[in-house]
Interface confidence: medium
């Protein structure tokens, strides 16, 4: 029946610890007498038997979902509007695999097994950005910001850790950034400063290490932003 179809991308790739939203639409004719029945949608892992296995996500409130995907996989779309969009946050390696959607409305029940979504979870290659506003002068305090702008709002907030031999204290913290107040000494020049970010929802960690450039106030103040390209190389942007 050409009226029975599901439209979703064949595969999606997400880095470990990050998030993805997969748009999805489904169609299925239903008998007139079920027009007022609620529409329940379910995402199942491939290989699941509907009567035996819990779904990874559903909008049915009294339906148990798989323990390992609870709170991370959400049926974000509204099935009553033919929307089966799936949200995955805190992606984990074990989320790798294929998933199929099932709809139930009254006596009409259908698993869209010929159009499955393949989820690929890859290594976290993104690294934190470290912002140093202006030159680091000996014995003068500066606010260094470590941020992960590529992380998503819906995920479990990351945990920031700083490592430095220089005298430091923690400043303001937002969901995706942490400020370190550093008061470098002349002997801290050339030493390492590391910002480590752990994504507890997936148990994955990423970090960036820079070398402190401590010098007496220069004529030409600059802002160093350590960005990198995820390859492990460090770039310096001067502004």
């Amino acid at each position: 029946d050409p009226r029975v179809r599901l439209e979703v991308q064949e595969s999606v790739t997400v880095q470990e610890g990050l998030c993805v939203l997969v748009p999805c639409t489904f169609f299925h004719p239903v008998p007139y007498h079920t027009r007022n029945s609620p529409v329940h949608g379910y995402w199942f892992r491939e290989g699941a038997i509907v009567s035996l296995d819990s779904p990874v996500a559903t909008n049915k409130l009294d339906q148990e979902v798989r323990e390992e995907t609870q709170g991370r996989f959400r049926l974000l779309g509204d099935p009553s509007r033919n929307n089966c969009s799936l949200s995955i946050v805190d992606a984990r390696r074990r989320d790798n695999g294929s998933y199929f959607f099932r709809m139930e409305k009254g006596s009409t029940k259908y698993s869209y097994k010929s159009t499955q979504l393949s989820v690929h979870v890859t290594d976290l290659t993104h690294r934190p950005q470290i912002l140093i506003p202006g030159a680091l002068d000996p014995d003068h305090s500066k606010n260094l910001t470590c941020s992960v702008p590529w992380a998503c709002e819906q995920g479990t907030p990351p945990i920031f850790s700083w490592m430095s031999a220089a005298p430091t204290s923690l400043g303001l913290r937002t969901t995706h950034s942490s400020v370190l107040i550093i008061t470098p000494r002349p002997q801290d020049h050339g030493t390492n400063l590391t910002c480590q970010v752990k994504f507890p929802g997936a148990g994955v960690t990423t970090e960036r290490t820079i070398q402190l450039n401590v010098s007496y106030a220069s004529q030409n103040p600059r802002t160093d932003i350590f960005l990198g390209d995820g390859s492990g190389k460090q770039g310096v942007v001067q502004g």
Epitope: E46, I49, S51, G97
Partner: antibody, heavy 117, light 106 residues
Framework: QVQLVQSGTEVKKPGSSVKVSCKVS????????ISWVRQAPGQGLEWMGR????????NYAQKFQGRVTITADKSTSTAYMELSSLRSEDTAVYYC??????????WGQGTMVTVSS | DIQLTQSPSSLSASVGDRVTITCRAS??????LAWSQQKPGKAPKLLIY???SLESGVPSRFSGSGSGTDFTLTISSLQPEDFATYYC????????FGQGTKLEIK
């Protein structure tokens, strides 16, 4: 091309256990569920249970609950079925089969298990 | 568990005949039904999945139909290699097989 290769013939005493292996080659082992199905001589097919290797969770037919254990070793792409407290009526050919949608699309060659005193 | 009842249990037919095997479920199973063929000493082979979808590599003379509780496997023109035992199996609630239909040469 995907293949399911099972371990060889077994002869067991009543009351003992048997463990049959099923090695998957030619495809991603953990993406699919693997079921075990048995067939007594001259009889029909009977589903015993199945495992989804990527999760490691198994489900069993009510008849075999408590007597069968299905496991999977992702490192060797091998599924196992262990049946305990064997009796003569467990004499059968045991097949592993790969789930594809709502069907078994690929089957192992079968393992004959004879239970005799 | 859902019971599947196949009929007939055995059937004699000739090459070129059109053959129909039915499978009735004890309760509705939507379209979660497959048909497989088994020859003596061999593992079963998938023919039809999702009640009516033909497995790749299976000749088009095989077709499946039905939904809910009543399903049919049809072989439009029997070939010598089609003489075997046919099983239906359901995947809607746990997994169960029909008792089989043995197709013999008349």
């Amino acid at each position: 091309q995907v293949q399911l290769v099972q371990s060889g013939t077994e002869v067991k005493k009543p009351g003992s256990s048997v463990k049959v292996s099923c090695k998957v080659s030619g495809d991603t082992f953990s993406s699919y569920a693997i079921s075990w199905v048995r067939q007594a001589p001259g009889q029909g097919l009977e589903w015993m249970g199945r495992i989804i290797p990527i999760i490691g969770i198994a489900n069993y037919a009510q008849k075999f609950q408590g007597r069968v254990t299905i496991t999977a070793d992702k490192s060797t792409s091998t599924a196992y079925m262990e049946l305990s407290s064997l009796r003569s009526e467990d004499t059968a050919v045991y097949y592993c089969a790969r789930h594809w949608l709502d069907a078994f699309d690929i089957w192992g060659q079968g393992t004959m298990v004879t239970v005799s005193s | 568990d859902i019971q599947l009842t196949q009929s007939p249990s055995s059937l004699s037919a000739s090459v070129g005949d059109r053959v129909t095997i039915t499978c009735r479920a004890s309760q509705g199973i939507s379209s979660a039904l497959a048909w497989s063929q088994q020859k003596p000493g061999k593992a079963p082979k998938l023919l039809i999945y999702d009640a009516s979808s033909l497995e790749s590599g299976v000749p088009s003379r095989f077709s499946g139909s039905g939904s809910g509780t009543d399903f049919t496997l049809t072989i439009s023109s029997l070939q010598p290699e089609d003489f075997a035992t046919y099983y239906c199996q359901q995947f809607n609630s746990s997994i169960t097989f029909g008792q089989g239909t043995k197709l013999e040469i008349k």
